[in-house]
């Protein structure tokens, strides 16, 4: 005889508000074997029991969350297993304060992650990352759990909030921090993130401090992601100072993203282009000064931006954007520096 | 030159009340994050408090939560410890400190103030 | 919490000896590390921030290292006014927290 359950998985994590089945079925040589779950606030409906199986029907309600077995007996022969069921609830619902920060000032932000469940600090981290890596000299303040104000009676979802005050930002500062909370889950993790940008100054800033004179790349999302993957979580590396970050993109994997190459032989003219397949364009947005005083081309996945008059091109960040997807690259172009390119 | 001066400690019941203050010079002291660190007789140092520097933020440490408050006057660059229900365990040298903007560790420190709790 | 575990508690040395202390973090405090010189009676001094940056005035025969969760404060020839109590503290994340301090004393 054989005992078989489906899936096969001791744990099983169930976003709120999906079904899952399990299934569990027995084959007895000697007549019709006695399958049936205990161990579960099973109310009506939620197990189907036919000859030789049983199916235990979860439907993603917080109360579902416990641990199931499943018993088959086959004549004097018996086997059980166990499924242990997490109910979780982890929306997309990132909030962060204040919408954008000040260069230059002592600062705290704070993100929010709304409607969570289970609030377990041990589930739940958060991060503040300068591009991909986590921001170095941030100091995390106490985190904060408060229970989500519910229309309807059941289990209450909880809102966990992370503050962090901020080391000084660099010169200049990058484009973007973003908040990146990630839910830790048997067989599953789960991120969503949300861009906090930086209130970029008017006046041109000061190169950064790097060793040449080389331009300098921050790649930045405009847009939050959810992303799920196995149990093979690559942890994100402690990165350096912002100063000392090298004038690269510092973005290897992820979303492709748009490239900026300088043309010295074009007087001072900058190329964004995009390789991500049809259908995406790119266009300029963001420039030292007004964006409108630039002589600009846009053709589809490419588009070139140059100074009128001609000449030296202005210090300061250049940004360009991709879409579909919002996806940009910044360039920080330091005064009269050798032509380099973002790739 | 910068200063920080404790004073209010004493000696009080269990039970009891007692406001610290520590009076700051030689800085602007409303751009700086200020901190409560404590020591008991012949033990190490153990965080209290901290307050923003524009009291916009504070935090305790579990030890005292609910009991202590920590306050500032920027207009009159002082730091306070409202310290309610008293404890025993509360007896200690009391500091303040000052915390550097952007990094954060305690570069500045009060010549502390003796509490003592004792029936 | 995050704990800080100094080592040793206490030690025994020289005038012009080498002398070092380590501290190690529950989890990883990054480069958030300060080490602070204590003597009895008086107020805690900031000798060392950000695990190896030497707080003006502090002479340079005092030096720390690491990073993460192992770091070392080493004085590298012991003056007469470095017999103190040294302590590690994180200001990573809140709350703050302190190693329970090493006393460096004439042997």
């Known amino acids: 005889q054989s005992f078989q359950v489906n899936p096969p998985e001791s744990e099983v994590a169930v976003a709120m508000g999906t079904s899952l089945q399990i299934t569990c079925s027995m084959s007895c040589d000697e007549g019709v074997a006695r399958v049936h779950w205990r161990g579960l606030d099973t109310s009506l409906g939620s197990v189907q029991t036919l000859p030789g199986s049983s199916i235990l029907s979860v439907r993603g309600m917080l109360s579902d969350t416990g641990t199931p077995v499943c018993v088959g007996s086959c004549g004097s022969r018996s086997f059980q297993h166990s499924v242990k069921i997490l109910v979780y609830a982890f929306p997309d619902q990132l909030v962060v304060s204040p919408e954008f920060l000040v260069p230059g000032q002592d600062q705290v932000v704070s993100c929010t992650a709304h409607n969570i469940w289970p609030a377990d600090p041990n589930s739940l981290s958060f991060a503040l990352l300068l591009g991909e890596q986590r921001l170095e000299g941030a100091q995390a303040l106490e985190p904060e759990q408060e229970e989500e104000i519910q229309e309807a009676e059941g289990t209450p979802l909880f809102r966990m909030t992370q503050r962090w005050r901020l080391p000084s930002l660099g010169t200049p500062a990058p484009p973007a921090l973003h908040c990146q909370v990630t839910m830790q889950l048997p067989k599953l993790v789960l991120t969503h993130r949300k861009e906090i940008p930086v209130l970029q100054s008017q006046t041109s800033p000061k190169p950064p401090n790097t060793t040449s004179a080389e331009p300098y790349i921050l790649t930045s999302s405009s847009t939050a992601e959810a992303v799920s993957t196995g149990l093979n979580i690559t942890t994100l590396p402690s990165a350096p100072p912002y100063p000392k970050l090298s004038p690269r993109t510092l973005s290897s994997e992820g979303p492709c993203r748009p490239k900026i190459h300088q043309d010295l032989e074009a007087g001072w003219e900058l190329l964004c282009e995009a390789s991500c397949g049809p259908g995406v364009t790119v266009r300029w947005t963001l420039a030292p000064g007004d964006l409108a005083t630039y002589h600009k081309r846009e053709a589809g996945a490419q588009a070139w931006l140059s100074v009128l008059p001609p000449g030296p091109m202005v210090e300061g960040w250049f940004q360009c954007r991709q879409d579909p997807g919002g996806e940009v690259t910044n360039l920080y172009v330091p005064g009269q520096v050798t032509p380099n390119s973002s790739s | 030159e910068v200063q920080l001066l404790e004073s209010g400690g004493g000696l009080v019941q269990p039970g009891g009340s007692l406001r610290l203050s520590c009076a700051a010079s030689?800085?602007?002291?409303?751009?700086?994050?200020m901190h409560w660190v404590r020591q008991a007789p012949g033990k190490g140092l153990e965080w209290i408090s901290y307050?923003?520097?524009?009291?916009?933020?504070?935090n305790y440490a579990d030890s005292v939560k609910g009991r202590f408050t920590i306050s500032r006057d920027n207009s009159k660059n002082t730091l306070y410890l409202q310290m309610n229900s008293l404890r025993a365990e509360d007896t200690a040298v009391y500091y303040c400190?000052?915390?550097?903007?952007?990094?954060?560790?305690?570069?500045?420190w009060g010549k502390g103030t003796t509490v003592t709790v004792s029936s | 919490d995050i704990q800080m575990t100094q080592s040793p508690s206490s030690l025994s040395a020289s005038v012009g000896d080498r002398v070092t202390i380590t501290c190690r973090a529950s989890?990883?405090?990054?480069?958030?590390l300060a080490w602070y010189q204590q003597k009895p009676g008086k107020a805690p001094k900031l000798l060392i921030y950000?695990?190896?940056s030497l707080q003006s005035g502090v002479p340079s025969r005092f030096s720390g290292s690491g990073s993460g969760t192992d770091f070392t404060l080493t004085i590298s020839s012991l003056q007469p006014e470095d017999f103190a109590t040294y302590y590690c503290?994180?200001?990573?994340?809140?709350?703050?927290?302190f190693g329970q301090g090493t006393k460096v004393e004439i042997k």
């Open positions: 400190a000052r915390d550097r903007p952007y990094y954060y560790y305690m570069d500045v």
């Open positions: 030689g800085f602007t002291f409303s751009d700086f994050w």
């Open positions: 307050i923003s520097g524009s009291s916009g933020y504070t």
């Open positions: 989890q990883s405090v990054s480069r958030s």
């Open positions: 950000a695990a190896s």
């Open positions: 503290q994180q200001y990573k994340s809140y709350p703050v927290t």
